[in-house]
């Protein structure tokens, strides 16, 4: 099939970075420069994708391949491909449209970005809670109340046998 | 490695042919670039060669040069010499093979002396 | 066409002393810039790229900053082998002339 078709197709024959050009006969001409093409075959080059204002270069534009963008310090890409950039806020705030706001009692964000997320409900798996929630940091659960009570033992599992063979990690 | 060759004395009006040679890379990963330098002068750039064959050329060159590229040479014709194209030609190697690239790696040029 | 227009033409300073080299672009090239060290009989070498991205086996004592159209090369303690002539040169290839890789005229540095 594939030489049959190129057979027919003379443009099959063209690598990544030309085009099969109609203007001369269908040769294969290289893209010119702020464009490119991935694949063989193609009848035209795409246009590079520029990196401008809030977004940044991460990868440059060839014959072959566009240019990669992300986002300046300050912010972080959303969408597939960078397509956006949003503002960070600090860790313990989330981003409204009235810009960073910190995080409501209750709930916290341990991220430059994303919302504010309610603390686990640490008696919801039956536990207390060992450390206190803050704006920057979800609470830590402990033990269940019953577990702590004067005259509870506890019990260490054994530990696994260790296989021959493998160190410790 | 990148070296010039075919820099030599001629008369005005004489086509020249300068080569580049390259080894230990690919001239289908690379773009090549052609510099002058008159003597006592600064660096002159003149074209380039990119990876996928695309020749780009300075503006001011308007025909009087002419660049070329096989698997492992890339050639500089100029076509129609004058004194003032009395120069050191080098050669050099782009980085990477993106359009906004640099040049890294440089030959140690060959000298062309027009005069009658 | 880009013009890169670099100054001073020439510039004289003493061991352990600082340089400064600017470069201006005749349009916005974003920080597509790269600084060359050439010595008589020697073909150019490589500095700085990206504006402000040191070379390999460069030394931190070279220093690039700026963008869009101006630029800045610092040369900092400087020593007697850093007598040379430096140009910037643009690796902007897509602008609207195409003319996307021109050299500034040059900047002879004179150590005493």
């Known amino acids: 099939f594939e030489r049959t078709r190129s057979l027919q197709d003379p443009c099959s024959n063209c690598p990544a970075g030309t085009f099969c050009d109609n203007n001369r006969n269908q040769i294969c001409s290289p893209c010119p420069p702020n464009s490119f093409s991935s694949a063989g075959g193609q009848r035209t080059c795409d246009i590079c994708r520029q990196c401008k204002g809030v977004f940044r270069t991460r990868k440059e534009c060839s014959s072959t391949s566009n240019a990669e963008c992300d986002c300046t310090p300050g912010f972080h890409c959303l969408g597939a491909g960078c397509s956006m950039c949003e503002q960070d806020c600090k860790q313990g705030q989330e981003l409204t449209k009235k810009g960073c706001k910190d995080c409501c009692f209750g709930t916290f964000n341990d991220q430059k970005r994303g919302i504010c997320r309610p603390w686990t409900n640490c008696s919801l798996d039956g536990k207390s809670v060992l450390v206190n929630g803050t704006k920057e940091r979800d609470v830590v659960c402990g033990p269940s109340p019953a577990d702590l009570s004067p005259g509870a033992s506890s019990v260490t599992p054994p530990a696994p046998a260790r296989e021959p063979g493998h160190s410790p990690q | 490695s990148v070296e010039e060759s075919g820099g030599r004395l001629v008369t005005p009006g004489t086509p020249l042919t300068l080569t580049c040679t390259v080894s230990?890379?690919?001239?289908?990963?690379?773009?090549m670039i052609w510099v002058r330098q008159a003597p006592g002068k600064g660096l002159e750039w003149i074209g380039v060669v990119y990876d996928n064959g695309y020749i780009s050329h300075a503006t001011w060159v308007k025909g009087r040069f002419t660049i070329s590229k096989t698997s492992t040479t890339v050639g500089l014709e100029i076509t129609s010499p004058t004194t003032e194209d009395t120069a050191t030609y080098f050669c050099?190697?782009?980085?990477?093979?993106?359009?906004?690239?640099?040049?890294?790696?440089w030959g140690q040029g060959t000298l062309v002396t027009v005069s009658s | 066409d880009i013009v890169m227009t670099q100054t001073p033409a020439s510039v004289e300073a003493a061991v352990g002393g600082t340089v400064t080299i600017k470069c201006q672009a005749s349009e916005s090239i974003s920080n597509y810039l790269a600084w060359y060290q050439q010595k008589p009989g020697q073909p150019p070498k490589l500095l700085i790229y990206?504006?402000?991205t040191l070379a390999s086996g460069v030394s931190s004592r070279f220093k690039g900053s700026g963008s869009g159209t101006e630029f800045t090369l610092t040369i900092s303690d400087l020593e007697s082998a850093d007598a040379a002539t430096y140009y910037c040169q643009t690796n902007y290839c897509c602008s609207s002339s195409d003319n996307g890789f021109a050299f500034g005229g040059g900047t002879e540095v004179v150590v005493k």
């Open positions: 050099a190697r782009s980085a990477d093979g993106s359009w906004s690239t640099y040049f890294n790696l």
């Open positions: 230990g890379f690919s001239l289908s990963t690379y773009a």
């Open positions: 990206k504006a402000s």
